[in-house]
């Protein structure tokens, strides 16, 4: 619960925060968990503790391991763990998954890519940005404070973005890089009057008495995320839950399935052990959103079992 993963590259600076929080006046002690050895606070050490922070200046592969921080408060000690992994630098351009920070999404209106963990470091602008290892150049790219802004975002802008900056500690400079994926989402969404794809209006569905039957109500409501959209079944104009027949249940199928970019919903009506009286009912597939409600009616008819006797 009170553990956080941190990672970095050898010969780069890595600063790790204690997962436990406290007041500025609380002291924080750091230990290397495997040896229970205290981490020094003197800045002349390559690895040293500075309050809530543990600093590797620079990091080495051998530094990998679990570090314990203890925040000493008046009433109890709060213990946290930092799971640190230092990786060797890759010779090729490819950034492996284990070095990637969380993916961010952008759109035409909002295309900020924040440089991960940068707030931990003592850095000065400008940040350097790379996409798939290529330095970003051109007026579309603007490094602003701790983030990159891309003007007129296009789907081709998706990819892995690396920020590079210099951490300064007592006059010494250390390089830091961090990479995250950027995906582009289409914000050109719209909403329209529901279109029921199945069943067809006044469809007759053949069923076998004594067998199970499934009816699917499928409708599309526009493109992109929909504010309000629902599909449901009614029996003789009554909601399934109110109809009171336990053999007949509805369950959601694929939720917000984007086929051809359209936002669609499915609702499956399951009829167990079909009975004669089920053939007398009117089954309504209803699709509704802010534009209104559309209804397609289905009736069941008996399907004669194939006679295998000669």
């Amino acid at each position: 619960k009170f553990s956080k993963q941190s990672w970095g590259l050898e010969n780069e600076a890595l600063i790790v925060r204690c997962p436990r929080q406290g007041k500025p006046s609380y002291t924080v002690d750091w230990y290397y968990s495997q040896t229970n050895k205290s981490i020094p606070t003197q800045e002349r050490n390559r690895v040293f503790a500075s309050g809530q922070l543990l600093k590797f200046l620079p990091a080495a592969v051998a530094d990998s391991g679990i570090y314990t921080c203890i925040v000493r408060s008046p009433t109890f000690n709060r213990t946290g763990y930092a799971n640190v992994t230092i990786y060797k630098k890759q010779s090729d351009c490819n950034v492996p998954d284990y070095l990637m920070y969380s993916t961010v999404s952008g759109s035409e209106k909002n295309s900020k890519i924040y440089c991960p963990t940068i707030d931990l470091y003592n850095w000065t602008a400008p940040l350097e940005w790379f996409k798939n290892c290529q330095a970003l150049q051109g007026s579309r790219y603007r490094a602003h404070k701790s983030f990159l802004v891309i003007d007129n975002v296009m789907t081709e802008d998706a990819g892995d973005y690396t920020c590079k900056f210099i951490h300064n500690e007592n006059g010494a400079n250390y390089s830091v890089t961090a990479t995250r994926s950027f995906t582009v989402k289409d914000e050109q969404g719209f909403s329209l009057f529901p279109v029921i794809g199945a069943p067809a209006q006044n469809e007759i569905k053949e069923v076998e008495i004594g067998k199970n039957a499934n009816l699917t109500c499928s409708a599309c409501f526009g493109k992109g995320t929909q504010f309000l959209a629902a599909v449901l079944w009614q029996l003789n104009g009554t909601k399934i839950t109110d109809f009171g027949e336990p053999r007949i249940q509805q369950e959601e199928g694929q939720n917000q399935s984007f086929s051809n970019g359209l936002a669609c919903l499915d609702m499956v009506l399951r009829i167990a052990d079909v009975k004669e009286e089920d053939l007398l009912l009117q089954y309504d597939c209803l699709a509704l959103n802010l534009h209104g409600l559309r209804r397609h009616t289905v009736r069941l008819s008996r399907k004669n079992p194939i006679d295998h006797h000669s």
């Epitope: 619960k1 436990r20 006046s25 009433t75």
Partner: antibody, heavy 116, light 113 residues
Framework: QIQLAQSGPELKKPGETVKISCKAS????????MNWVKQAPGKDLKWMGW????????TYGDNFKGRFAFSLETSASTVYLQINNLKNEDTATYFC?????????WGQGTLVTVSA | DIVMTQSPPSLSVSVGEKVTMSCKSS????????????LAWYQQKPGQPPKLLIY???TRESGVPDRFTGSGSGTDFTLTISSVQAEDLAVYYC?????????FGGGTKLEIK
């Protein structure tokens, strides 16, 4: 400058749910925990608990366990207070306050009124 | 829970007068680990959030006028306003900043004659 901006006033009926927000700006959000404080009309201040903004771990005061939930959206530097099954006695102004030696930074407060 | 008791509940003074208010805690707020007293004082004006005046029992928050002074240790604490100004009209709260649950006193309402 450091600011905590809270969502607007809420009028709710008993039994309903309310979720109020507190958006932090001007500092590194995950460096400091966030407290919630309740003040009923004309009454004194009651500490409700706090949330660790780095790992999302909430701590609740004894009188605020069960119906109350703290949560956060780190990417938006925002913490939330949700109160379920509202009661008349939940009518109060709710403040967020940044953890520190004393609470130096407070939101402007969100008035929640519970009335049938 | 630590109980914070403030006195007096209210007081009325003239501009320029010196005023002191008391706050007592049911347990010591001194942390031997760093010799800090975890007590804070706040000023709250109508319709506003509380404003931190003093933390650590005696450290004045940045921007707070030097007429406000906090003192005391352990369980007994005092807030002194050396020369009350009209804008000091408010309710003053002390707070246990030592251990959960953080608790506030009932407040001292300062009125100007």
């Amino acid at each position: 400058q450091i600011q905590l901006a809270q969502s607007g006033p809420e009028l709710k009926k008993p039994g309903e749910t309310v979720k109020i927000s507190c958006k932090a700006s001007g500092y590194t959000f995950i460096n400091y925990g966030m407290n919630w404080v309740k003040q009923a009309p004309g009454k004194d201040l009651k500490w409700m608990g706090w949330i660790n903004t780095y790992i999302g771990e909430p701590t609740y005061g004894d009188n605020f366990k069960g119906r109350f939930a703290f949560s956060l959206e780190t990417s938006a530097s925002t913490v939330y207070l949700q109160i379920n099954n509202l009661k008349n006695e939940d009518t109060a102004t709710y403040f967020c306050a940044r953890e520190g030696d004393g609470f130096a930074y407070w939101g402007q407060g969100t008035l929640v009124t519970v009335s049938a | 829970d630590i109980v914070m008791t403030q006195s007096p509940p209210s007081l009325s003074v003239s501009v320029g007068e010196k005023v002191t208010m008391s706050c007592k805690s049911s347990q010591s707020l001194l942390y031997s680990g760093n010799q800090n007293n975890y007590l804070a004082w706040y000023q709250q004006k109508p319709g506003q959030p509380p404003k931190l005046l003093i933390y650590g029992a005696s450290t004045r928050e940045s921007g707070v006028p030097d007429r406000f002074t906090g003192s005391g240790s352990g369980t007994d604490f005092t807030l002194t306003i050396s020369s009350v100004q009209a804008e000091d009209l408010a309710v003053y709260y002390c707070q246990n900043d030592h251990s959960y649950p953080y608790t506030f006193g009932g407040g001292t309402k300062l009125e100007i004659k």
